[in-house]
Each structure stands twice: as structure tokens, then as C-alpha cells.
Interface confidence: low
Amino acid sequence: AAIGSCSKEYRVLLGQLQKQTDLMQDTSRLLDPYIRIQGLDVPKLREHCRERPGAFPSEETLRGLGRRGFLQTLNATLGCVLHRLADLEQRLPKAQDLERSGLNIEDLEKLQMARPNILGLRNNIYCMAQLLDNSDTAEPTKAGRGASQPPTPTPASDAFQRKLEGCRFLHGYHRFMHSVGRVFSKWGESPNRSRR
């Protein structure tokens, strides 16, 4: 939905948010294609692809924020994710190079869908914040206030380490979205229930 065309129906909005976060925690939509495209699919490499502790807010932290703080933190974190994804996309091979090397073009398309999907989620976050009458939550195009941002990655010594850093970041992102989904799943039937 475009900004300004927010649903006023809480359950519809919550359903959309839950559906979007369900999709975004699916590694086959982002992490797995990234691993294939970047040539990181050597045995057990996922063990080196674990997120760095503290890169994303934990589920425990998210649960303790209350609805307003949660949406604000989610919005800000996704803002950081958008910046990192833009950076990662610049380092990806181009479509014509993929075709020449026999790589699956669908993997690149999946990666390129990540940012539009996040923008859609941020729009619904904005709509939900409006519904909760939370004027503090930033619009989707801005980073929210009061949220800790995922740290800038350590400067990588070489191309492989940069790929690995991207891999760790995406692993953390999927884990974070899983936590987000669990928090949304605990939200009640009404915007007024358990409101802090």
C-alpha cells in the first residue's frame, strides 16, 4: 500500500505485518541466494555465517519495549537494513554476468526484491503506528528515534571477508525478523489491548 492509503482495520494491518515478517524470516528469500551468488556454499560455511552478537535487537529486548517502542525500534532497524542491502547489492554480479557463468538469475531477482519488500513492511509499520496513535514513530522513509542501530561492519581485509560479513548480517536479519514475527504473534485482537 502507498503511504497515505493506510487500512484503518487493526486486524487487517496486523495480519499483513505478520505475513510480511513470516516471509522475511525465510532464508530462501535472501540469505540462501546470497550464499549461492557469492560462492560461499562450501561445506559447513554456515557456521561462519552466524551473526555477530548485538548486531540486532534480541527478542527479549523487543518484547520489553511495548508496542510503540517496538514499532519505533523495528522501523529504525529496518532503515539500517535498507542501507546495508543497498551496499550489498552494489557488490553483486550483474544479471548478464550471472547468465554467462550459469548462475540462477532467480537468485539475483530474489535479492533485488528484498528492499521493496522492506519498504512495504515499513509502510505498514507506519500505518500501525498511526492506528495506535503513536506520533513518535517515524515515517517509513526516515530512521526512527531511540533504537540502537546495527553496528557498521568491521572493515574487511579482502573480498571474501566482505562476502562473509554480508552473510553474517543477513543471518542476523533473518533471525531478527523471526523474533519480530514472534512479537507480532503475541499482539491481541484489539489495538487497545495490552497497550502501554
Partner: antibody
Framework: EVQLVQSGAEVKKPGESLKISCKGS????????IGWVRQMPGKGLEWMGI????????RYSPSFQGQVTISADKSISTAYLQWSSLKASDTAMYYC???????????WGQGTLVTVSS | DIVMTQSPDSLAVSLGERATINCKSS????????????LAWYQQKPGQPPKLLIY???TRESGVPDRFSGSGSGTDFTLTISSLQAEDVAVYYC?????????FGQGTKVEIK
């Protein structure tokens, strides 16, 4: 600092058993593979096999399958290479090395010289 | 098994001159799924363990001087030392990790002329 420290040189007789060790430090021992590489006197490098200490998943080169056993004890960050019955042709320098799966080996132990002679 | 063949077996080069070592694999080590060449280069000095120089055919390991470079794709690869230094005297090995068992070339001995 990543380090792989191997046990000392061994002199054995044919038919004897032997277990040499490789202790890792300075990194998460259970998150990387440990490979073993043989170098016979004046010769090149031969890959023997690898183990993933996290779950003891082990892969052998067909040339060494059944000739040696690779194992690991993650509680003490140590990998092992053992023979149940040594032959004179086992005389060589044996290196352990850290790897990203069955791939390149980025850190190497100092080597253990095994001499088998009657 | 993939057979790795290096040439030449030995090489004598003057200090400051370029040294070139070739490595040929019996089948391609280029993964069509990710466009990476599964090839590494090692340096072994007398009495020392091997040291990783290059992986993914052309990525220099951290701390390796930039006079070392790797190139090539598919079945033909090259390690180049752009300006040979005294400390570069060693045996150099290529290694494929496209498939198990991992296999090494027989080695190329680099000496000073």
C-alpha cells in the same frame, strides 16, 4: 592469535600403534574443520581427510580410508590422527590445518615427524 | 580425483624479476553455480609448514605481500611473484578444493638465479 600446536616427533616400529594430536587455540575450535596433510620425505603435500569438531563429521581421502582414523575432542579443542598398525611407508611429516569445510587451509600446525623403522 | 599439474618443476629467477608458476587441473574447478574457481596457492619454506597465499584463485590472504597475485579460470591458473625477493625462495603448491579428495600440485621450487 590463531594457533595449531601439534604433538612432538615420534619414532616407532612397524606394527605399533600411534596417535598424534593437534590443539587449536585463538578461535572457535568447533566452528572450523581440521584437515590432515601428509608430506613424505622430499615429496609434495597429500590431503588425508578432515573432521568438523562441532559434530565429528569426518571425510577421508580414498587413499587413506581405512589406513588412519581422524577424531576430535572438542572439550579440549584437540584433533587426532591415529594408526592401529604402522608401516615403514608411514614415515612422513604430518600437518594439521584449519579449513573452511573441504576447502583451502588457512592456518597450519608446525608438523609432527613420524619415523617408522625396525 | 582431480589431478593438478604444475610447471615448471623448478624455476631460477633473478632478484627483482618476475616469477611465474603455472597450474593445470585435469578438469575445471570453476563452479558454474557461483562463478568461483576453487583453487588455492601455498608457499612452503624449508623446514616450515605451508602458508596460504591465495584462495578463490585470486584472493590474497591477509598479510600476504601484494607482489603475489593469482589469476586464471577453469583449468589453467597462474601464480605470479612480480618482483622476487630473497625471502620468496620456497616451494609453491596449487590445490583444488572443487571436489574431494582435495589434491595438490607436485610443487614448484623457486630459487634465486
Amino acid at each position: 592469535e590463531v594457533q595449531l600446536v601439534q604433538s612432538g616427533a615420534e619414532v616407532k616400529k612397524p606394527g605399533e600403534s600411534l596417535k598424534i594430536s593437534c590443539k587449536g587455540s585463538g578461535y572457535s575450535f568447533t566452528s572450523y574443520w581440521i584437515g590432515w596433510v601428509r608430506q613424505m620425505p622430499g615429496k609434495g603435500l597429500e590431503w588425508m581427510g578432515i573432521i568438523y569438531p562441532g559434530d565429528s563429521d569426518t571425510r577421508y581421502s580414498p587413499s587413506f580410508q581405512g589406513q588412519v582414523t581422524i577424531s576430535a575432542d572438542k572439550s579440549i579443542s584437540t584433533a587426532y590422527l591415529q594408526w592401529s598398525s604402522l608401516k615403514a611407508s608411514d614415515t612422513a611429516m604430518y600437518y594439521c590445518a584449519r579449513g573452511f569445510g573441504a576447502s583451502y587451509l588457512d592456518y597450519w600446525g608446525q608438523g609432527t615427524l613420524v619415523t617408522v623403522s625396525s | 580425483d582431480i589431478v593438478m599439474t604444475q610447471s615448471p618443476d623448478s624455476l631460477a629467477v633473478s632478484l627483482g624479476e618476475r616469477a611465474t608458476i603455472n597450474c593445470k587441473s585435469s578438469q575445471s574447478v570453476l563452479a558454474s553455480s557461483n562463478n568461483n574457481n576453487f583453487l588455492a596457492w601455498y608457499q612452503q619454506k624449508p623446514g616450515q609448514p605451508p602458508k596460504l597465499l591465495i584462495y578463490w584463485a585470486s584472493t590474497r590472504e591477509s598479510g600476504v605481500p601484494d607482489r603475489f597475485s593469482g589469476s586464471g579460470s577453469g583449468t589453467d591458473f597462474t601464480l605470479t611473484i612480480s618482483s622476487l625477493q630473497a625471502e620468496d625462495v620456497a616451494v609453491y603448491y596449487c590445490q583444488q578444493y572443487y571436489s574431494t579428495p582435495l589434491t595438490f600440485g607436485q610443487g614448484t621450487k623457486v630459487e634465486i638465479k
